[in-house]
Amino acid sequence: ARNGDHCPLGPGRCCRLHTVRASLEDLGWADWVLSPREVQVTMCIGACPSQFRAANMHAQIKTSLHRLKPDTVPAPCCVPASYNPMVLIQKTDTGVSLQTYDDLLAKDCHCI
Amino acid sequence: ARNGDHCPLGPGRCCRLHTVRASLEDLGWADWVLSPREVQVTMCIGACPSQFRAANMHAQIKTSLHRLKPDTVPAPCCVPASYNPMVLIQKTDTGVSLQTYDDLLAKDCHCI
């Protein structure tokens, strides 16, 4: 139930994929990751106005109840719908190894 | 990677399951749902402080980058980790039918 992809708040204001550049130091990884030295972190950022990219029925309910009880029920939130794997070269006790993380980089976003 | 379940903000302030009572009118369902007349909607509400119920590596990264760039990167968000199905009695062209929705009621929460 991926509802409307038209953002009523103006271009780029609603939930979408953004790329944030981060160093190993920024991420707190400098002591266990060798490479890459800099990571292009893709993440989901932006507002979730009524029915925009609603992930499911729960998101639609949340929108309705947020409208009625904004102090109790928060608006839906922009989160990853899927991920791209990322490969890191990690330090190990015996040297280095490649490690793949499936849940590190957002690939697609929705509101929930 | 479901990190700490201890809420540093005080009891009940962090991401957890809440129940919100809603009528069919509240949900905008009165024209297509016969029963139940009132729904106990379980949803995920609360703050996601550093590493609290972090769903995965992405959530951990988000926490680190939010600390560094709070105006650019939002904090992780409290969303369902899983759902409970819910059965509705719906109006149809020919009468009524039972319909099960798998993604309506939050069962468990995490931060992402």
Epitope: S35, P85, M86, V87 | -
Partner: nanobody, 121 residues
Framework: QLQLVESGGGLVQPGGSLRLSCVAS????????IGWFRQAPGKGLEGVSC????????YYADSVKGRFTISRDNAKNTAYLQMNSLKPEDTAIYYC??????????????WGQGTQVTVSS
């Protein structure tokens, strides 16, 4: 355009060997790091090995260390993955990819179409 083509896959018995090749066209391979990925049935992509462009440093996933060897022949614009002591869990589609440095990522600039490796008795 930039293109990579893998070959050398097939059906092999447990304990057997295969050598996969990755031929580049449209660009010179020696300017790039080469990575091998695999995708087992119902699983996500996994980085298996990588060889850097500069000093030819090599990197391996723990699951293949000591059994797989990555190499390159810049004169032939080709990279290789020698796979020995194959196990049923190595069954997957194997892809090569090229990028500026190791570790090569899923979002890299050039990506092959894959070659199937099946390890079964």
């Amino acid at each position: 355009q930039l293109q990579l083509v893998e070959s050398g896959g097939g059906l092999v018995q447990p304990g057997g060997s295969l050598r996969l090749s990755c031929v580049a066209s449209g660009f010179t391979l020696d300017d790039y790091a080469i990575g091998w990925f695999r995708q087992a049935p119902g699983k996500g992509l996994e980085g298996v090995s990588c060889i850097s462009s500069s000093d030819e440093s090599t990197y391996y996933a723990d699951s293949v260390k000591g059994r797989f060897t990555i190499s390159r022949d810049n004169a032939k614009n080709t990279a290789y993955l020698q796979m020995n002591s194959l196990k049923p869990e190595d069954t997957a589609i194997y892809y090569c990819a090229a990028d500026t440095e190791c570790p090569v990522q899923v979002t890299s600039m050039a990506w092959g179409q894959g070659t199937q490796v099946t390890v079964s008795s």
